[in-house]
């Protein structure tokens, strides 16, 4: 088993990265002299207990700096948030942390992220730009849920 | 507030089947871990398995695999221990526990009270 | 299958400070056993009071506090009052299975 998280980088199909701006993941066009949060993930160790065929279960992270995406519910609402949180304390867990696990699904180059707590519910950004990252249902509509992850080795 | 009622007392002849029921209240089942855990006398306590109520997932402890059978029905917020080929051995207090990540660990904790199996003829 | 064995009963006064430990035969208990107690009082109620080896649970009096000694897990009441007499036990996690330990009648003599 890998047993260190992977980095990556991630940008979606309007070649928007994710940047950290006050603790918060946003979406914005790639510049000059911009910092994009590289990710870490790494697979659920646990991934037999988990439901098959919905992707591979990965917590989600951002590489050295103690902050792992979650899903909770605000009211009767899943919200994304960033807590911090040392990715491999979640892996190393004797069960599935699923408030930080996502289901990663590959399509070609497309990846998506659904929540394990919330299922039917992706990481997504709104078409605007410039706006935090959310959880959605609505998938194809006003949000975008297709991003490309490159892995960095 | 956060409780688990378990099913009352059984009393079952060896060779036959039997199903225990625990019924949570107060929090959503399917944001937790249900344990069962078995207790005899003198004997301190024994972990039979898990069920994860959100997927149906199980795991259970290689003694008791293929002799219990961990169900959850969604529905009514209820999980199941089945035992089946009962023998006296499986005389014991069968407890339900919860067990809940808070914070940066998984706690086991809340359990129910407790249901009384005898296995006699 | 790992064996986890505690001391089968303590005795303690109130105010004074009281260690149980949880051992395990297939070598040192670390962090990744995630080391839980669990209190059981009369009538078979029981309640748990550390997870992660050393978190205390919500609502949890801050006199018992779960900790590491050399090869064991520990837990120490620093204070205990008579309300803590009842038996403990430890859950140890190996992999992919929990085993208890045979737990520790604890008597607070008041």
């Known amino acids: 088993k890998i047993d260190t998280p992977q980095r990556g980088s991630i940008q979606d199909i309007n070649h928007r990265v994710w940047v950290l701006q006050d603790q918060t993941l946003i979406a914005v066009p790639r510049k000059d002299r911009m910092s994009p949060v590289t990710i870490a993930l790494i697979s659920c160790r646990h991934v037999e207990t988990l439901e098959k065929d919905r992707g591979n279960p990965i917590y989600l992270g951002l590489n050295g700096l103690n902050l792992c995406l979650m899903c909770a519910k605000v009211g009767d609402q899943p919200t994304l948030q960033l807590k911090e949180k040392d990715i491999m304390d979640l892996y190393n867990q004797p069960e599935p942390v699923k408030s930080f696990l996502f289901y990663h699904s590959q399509s070609g180059r497309n990846s998506t992220f659904e929540s394990v707590a919330f299922p039917g519910w992706f990481i997504a950004v709104s078409s605007e730009g410039g706006c935090p990252l959310i959880l959605t249902q609505e998938l194809g509509k006003a949000n975008t849920t297709d991003f490309g992850l490159t892995m960095l080795f | 507030e956060v409780q688990l009622q378990q099913s009352g007392a059984e009393l079952v002849k060896p060779g036959a089947s039997v199903r225990l029921s625990c019924t949570a209240s107060?929090?959503?089942?399917?944001?937790?871990?249900i344990h069962w855990v078995k207790q005899r006398p003198e004997q301190g306590l024994e972990w039979i398995g898990r069920i994860d109520p959100a997927i149906g997932t199980t795991r259970y402890d290689p003694k008791f695999q293929g002799k219990a059978t961990i169900t959850t029905d969604t529905s009514s917020d209820t999980v199941h221990l089945q035992f089946s080929s009962l023998t006296s051995e499986d005389t014991a207090v069968y407890y339900c526990a919860r067990l809940h990540y808070f914070g940066n660990n998984f706690f086991f904790d809340y359990w129910g009270q407790g249901t009384t199996l005898t296995v006699s003829s | 299958q790992a064996v986890v064995t505690q001391e089968s009963a303590l005795t303690t006064s109130p105010g004074e400070a009281v260690t149980l430990t949880c051992r395990s035969s297939s070598g040192a208990v670390t962090t990744s056993n995630y080391a839980n107690w669990v209190q059981e009082k009369p009538d078979h109620l029981f309640a748990g009071l550390i997870g992660?080896?050393?978190d205390r649970a919500p609502g949890v009096p801050a006199r018992f506090s779960g900790s590491l000694i050399g090869d064991k897990a520990a837990l120490t009441i620093t204070g205990a009052q008579t309300e803590d007499e009842a038996i403990y036990f430890c859950a140890l996690w190996f992999s992919n299975h929990w085993v208890f330990g045979g737990g520790t009648k604890l008597t607070v003599l008041g």
């Open positions: 992660g080896t050393n």
């Open positions: 107060g929090f959503n089942i399917k944001d937790t871990y």
